[in-house]
Amino acid sequence: LQDPCSNCPAGTFCDNNRNQICSPCPPNSFSSIGGQPNCNICRVCAGYFRFKKFCSSTSNAECDCTPGFHCLGAGCSMCEQDCKQGQELTKKGCKDCCFGTFNDQKRGICRPWTNCSLDGKSVLVNGTKERDVVCGPSPADLSPGASSVTPPAPAREPGHSPQ
């Protein structure tokens, strides 16, 4: 004999209290696959979360973060504050990048400047807290009399790119 519950589509549940008939999911609940004995409670996007997609009878709500925050974890399980470019988020809050490092994102940590000399190049544009060094041609490639910017202190390595 076929299980009568298997006929219940997504958006319904198999109601054992009503002779296993298919009942629609109550408000603020959903079932994304058929044949379920109950519906799942919809996710609520509150606090630093905001609705990216509202709940329907067949799919859960999806959240993202309010401006000034970004998602972490599968399905945006947490909102973490943004920092400014040129900063990194430490456990004690946003802090400026140390000399020789930069961050061109609003999240993550500061990255060491590119060390142009490792690839036989020279520094064309110095790095800042917000931007990586720009490397130019190798010193040998520069024509006589041409000058390159001297690297600022013992710079280490590279930078970051847009998402």
Epitope: R111, V134, C135
Partner: antibody
Framework: QVQLVQSGAEVKKPGASVKVSCKAS????????MHWVRQAPGQGLEWMGW????????NYAQKFQGRVTMTRDTSISTAYMELSRLRSDDTAVYYC?????????????WGQGTLVTVSS | SYVLTQPPSVSVAPGETARITCGGD??????VHWYQKKPDQAPVLVVY???YRPSGIPERISGSNSGNTATLTLSRVEAGDEADYYC????????????FGGGTQLIILG
């Protein structure tokens, strides 16, 4: 979907060079740093360096400086790692791995690995 | 450069909880990432930034980090969890920014 496909296994003699490629698809190649990590037989994971595919800027672990060169060809969305003056202890599986769009997080996508064997 | 210390192996029976530690000076101030590595497969990121799971990683895998120790916890372990697990941090102040722990072999008993 994001995919990183690496070149095939190589056998090299000591003193030679090897160049491993990593072709990216399913995302904007220039928007995400690429890292290289290796694992020698019976050993752990070892970070080698990164390249910014947008600018070509690199950072190499000090251990490999002078022997490693990381480059990219944006026209074919491919990153390369060349290791020169190979020694027997460079025998390892070499992986490319993508950074998730900002520095300080985990490497979210990895290539399948390229076995490099250095033997006389 | 920065050093991460992991136990070589951890053994646990199926259905039990495995805890893998990663020690480092003031590691609680850093963001720790964990990778699962099975033979002849590429590493898989299972926890990032101390405690966040990428999509597709089961909820029974979790992470924590404070003081000098970060911990990866696998509850209700299964045979398929048998693998090597590596912790990793970024250390921008050193000439070797990418740092991995030595790895821990998770052995499922029985």
């Amino acid at each position: 979907q994001v995919q990183l496909v690496q070149s095939g296994a190589e056998v090299k003699k000591p003193g030679a060079s090897v160049k491993v490629s990593c072709k990216a698809s399913g995302y904007t190649f220039t928007g995400y740093y690429m890292h290289w990590v290796r694992q020698a037989p019976g050993q752990g994971l070892e970070w080698m360096g990164w390249i910014n595919p947008n600018s070509g800027g690199t950072n190499y672990a000090q251990k490999f400086q002078g022997r490693v060169t990381m480059t990219r060809d944006t026209s074919i969305s491919t990153a390369y790692m060349e290791l020169s003056r190979l020694r027997s202890d460079d025998t390892a599986v070499y992986y490319c791995a993508r950074e998730p769009g900002y520095y300080g997080s985990g490497l979210d996508y990895w290539g399948q690995g390229t076995l490099v064997t250095v033997s006389s | 450069s920065y050093v991460l210390t992991q136990p070589p192996s951890v053994s646990v029976a199926p259905g039990e909880t495995a805890r893998i530690t990663c020690g480092g000076d003031d590691i609680g101030d850093k963001r720790v990432h964990w990778y699962q590595k099975k033979p002849d497969q590429a590493p898989v990121l299972v926890v990032y930034e101390d405690r966040y799971r990428p999509s597709g990683i089961p909820e029974r895998i979790s992470g924590s980090n404070s003081g000098n120790t970060a911990t990866l916890t696998l509850s209700r372990v299964e045979a398929g969890d048998e693998a090597d697990y590596y912790c990793q941090v970024w250390d921008s102040s050193s000439d070797h920014p990418g740092v991995f722990g030595g790895g821990t072999q998770l052995i499922i008993l029985g």
